[in-house]
């Protein structure tokens, strides 16, 4: 039943019926279930095992109606022990000879069958009236997870018999279910830390410790929330949890004061073009507060006066930014600064970077196109465009010529070296219009194309000629 202790002898007189394993004759040698010890087991309760109120098996056959009720004997109802101790408890049952079919005893905890790793032994004590069975269960070095309600089950004549439970209550040092966590806080700003520990035994009382000194003189009941009014420097906090079994100390957590970040380091140029520079950096220490964004500062290095600084803002990650809209073939000084919620870091060391030469900014001028009928070629001439220093060194020209006639369209291009200002290209189609455009090329790239110059290629010897430097679109002069 549900009493905590073994039944009193007075109650035993009223309730007891049938043989008890604890009172088997001394000369009865037990026989063991497979894999069990052959050592004599102690009786369930030092000679005082007691039957439960029987829940008689409800069997239906005529023969089985004559069978006496069978039930597990009563055993101790409640065991309290400390963590890491060993514990043994048992179930016992007396099966009269009239019962033919019995299955092994299984152990259950909180409604789930205990399988595998648990250590249980079943032993059988036969006599002339039947057999007494003792199932011993042992746990070495109990843990909190062994807390629970244990009981036995057995099938007798296809009927499931269940014992009364044995409550196992494991007590130990307080066990933390919530420990304080490291936080980063603003200087002189209040914050909370939480600590929660449980038994059993309850209650669990909490002391807070800051830099090895107790914060609260009187303990607080778990869970405890410590409100720290503010800090000016890093501190280490922990909590002590006390119960009747002793004391457990939580991990120590660092509470850091948020500061401005350290400046970024290792600023590098990953790539340069005529008008952009790709810069990377390694963020400095974040000052215990996530970096929010970074600022790339750019100034022209060649200026004698302290020229204006261009500022480009970007997210803190990735640590990469392409500075655009720069002049070609120019030198720049670049530095990076990053910000967290407290403020901006100092700037990184300045580094020098250069843009490459640009593409030409103007097209070749005074373009003329002649048809040389005898050689069946177009003779193209132009004037070299005015190229600035930052546009780079002229390396050649690209000539685009498009041929159109009824039902035919052909788009071609040629590259010529910078030597001279003329070129010849073979006629591709007769009775067609040819449109010519020319662009200058430097190492920085290709410049804009000139306005188109059109020439009509006759079927025979007639020729329309259209000289043009920079004519209006579609303008055609005949000759």
């Amino acid at each position: 039943g549900g009493t905590a202790e073994k039944w009193e002898e007075t109650e035993l007189d009223q309730l007891f019926s049938g043989p008890l394993p604890g009172r088997l004759p001394v000369n009865h040698r037990p026989f063991s279930a497979p894999h069990s010890s052959r050592d004599q087991l102690p009786p369930p309760q030092t000679g005082r095992s007691h039957p439960a109120h029987t829940a008689a098996p409800q069997v239906t056959s005529t023969a089985s109606k004559l069978l006496p009720p069978v039930a597990f004997n009563h055993t101790i109802g409640h065991i309290v022990l400390s963590e890491h101790k060993n514990v043994k408890f048992n179930c016992s049952i007396n099966i009269p000879n009239t019962y033919q079919e019995t299955a092994g005893i299984s152990w259950w905890k909180d409604g789930k069958e205990l399988l595998g790793a648990h250590h249980s032994i079943t032993q059988f004590y036969p006599d002339e009236e039947g057999v007494s069975i003792i199932a011993l269960f042992s746990i070495a070095s109990v843990q909190r997870s062994d807390n629970g309600s244990y009981f036995c089950k057995m099938k007798v004549n296809n009927r499931e018999i269940v014992s009364d439970p044995i409550y196992v209550e494991v007590q130990g040092l307080p066990y933390f279910i919530k420990q304080p966590e490291s936080v980063n806080v603003t200087r002189n700003t209040a914050f909370n830390l939480t600590c929660q520990a449980v038994g059993p035994p309850e209650p669990v009382n909490i002391f807070w410790v800051q830099n090895s000194s107790r914060v609260n003189e009187k303990p607080e009941r778990s869970p405890s929330v410590l409100t720290v009014p503010g800090l000016t420097e890093t501190a280490v906090f922990s909590c002590e949890a006390h119960n009747d079994k002793g004391l457990t100390v939580s991990k120590g957590v660092h509470i850091n004061i948020k500061v401005i970040p350290s400046p970024p380091t290792e600023v590098h140029i990953l790539n340069s073009t005529a008008h952009s520079i790709l810069v990377s950096w390694v963020p400095g220490f974040d000052g215990y507060s996530p970096l929010q964004n970074c600022s790339i500062q750019v100034k022209e290095a060649d200026r004698l006066s302290n020229g204006s600084v261009m500022v480009f803002n970007t997210s803190a990650s990735p640590h990469l930014y392409e500075i655009q809209q720069l002049q070609a073939l120019a030198n720049y000084s670049i530095a990076v600064s990053c910000r967290n919620e407290i403020g901006w870091s100092a700037v990184s060391p300045w580094i020098l970077a250069s843009t490459t030469e640009g593409a030409p900014s103007v097209a070749p001028l005074n373009i003329t196109v002649f048809l040389n009928e005898s050689n069946n070629i177009l003779d193209i001439r132009w004037t070299k465009p005015p190229i600035k220093r930052q546009d780079g060194e002229l390396v050649g020209y690209r000539i685009s010529h498009v041929w159109e006639s009824a039902g035919t369209y052909k788009e071609l291009s040629e590259e010529v070296s910078q030597n001279g200002s003329w070129a010849q290209i073979p006629v591709q189609i007769h009775n067609a219009t040819c449109t010519v455009r020319i662009a200058a090329i430097t190492k920085g790239g290709i410049g804009p194309f000139s306005e188109p110059v059109n020439i009509i290629i006759p079927e025979h010897s007639k020729v329309d000629y259209a000289p043009s430097s920079t004519p209006a679109p579609g303008n055609t002069d005949s000759m």
Epitope: G1, G2, T3, A4, E5, K6, E8, E11, A52, H53, T54, A55, A71, I76, G77, H78, I79, V80, W108, K109, D110, G111, K112, N147, G148, S149, F151, I161, V162, S163, D164, P165, Y167, V168, E169, P200
Partner: antibody
Framework: QVQLQQSGPELVKPGASVKISCKAS????????IHWVKQRPGQGLEWIGW????????KYNENFRGKATLTADTSSSTAYMQLSSLTSEDSAVYYC???????????WGQGTSVTVSS | DAVMTQTPLSLPVSLGDQASISCRSS???????????LHWYLQKPGQSPQLLIY???NRFSGVLDRFSGSGSGTDFTLQISRVEAEDLGVYFC?????????FGSGTKLEIK
Amino acid sequence: QVQLQQSGPELVKPGASVKISCKASGYSFTSYYIHWVKQRPGQGLEWIGWIFPGNGNTKYNENFRGKATLTADTSSSTAYMQLSSLTSEDSAVYYCARLGLIYALDYWGQGTSVTVSS
Amino acid sequence: DAVMTQTPLSLPVSLGDQASISCRSSQSLESSNGNTYLHWYLQKPGQSPQLLIYRVSNRFSGVLDRFSGSGSGTDFTLQISRVEAEDLGVYFCLQVTHVPFTFGSGTKLEIK
């Protein structure tokens, strides 16, 4: 979390019977004793008995033997108490409670009021 | 049966005062397994009883440390160090060492 939900109030005539229920949740119903307690208006508490739902075993306070019958339905995790041959003395609030691992009645139902009146 | 005698029946207190309730059993409540199964409950008006102290001196989960229990054998005491308004109600002791389980008659804690 452990909860015991009892059935609603009952108004019954003398000599009749009543069956009140206690639905358990939040733990293994078949593993813990359910106890029943009587409280008459403005009076103390009286222990009626227990049932272990895992095997149906019961134990009664002799004062309630023949008056109360305890049963349990494991499929619905519900314990029942039937009170028979009701008289005005049976008018009371009846509580179910779980006997927890600490061997105390740790969680209680909200109580069921039974009024016996003609 | 183990008869539980609880005193006083009524305990008028001022908020912030200490309160002490006694429970005496007609037989020892120490079980043969070494534990003493004497528990204390509070029943607030219109509510179910709630467990405060189990096995003489262990506070149940969530119970404030104003509540403490002591005693052994047959004599037990519940103490409330600083009474607050939320502590008002009827306090019962309960023994579960012997069948039938028996309750004390109750002590009503009320404001002076």
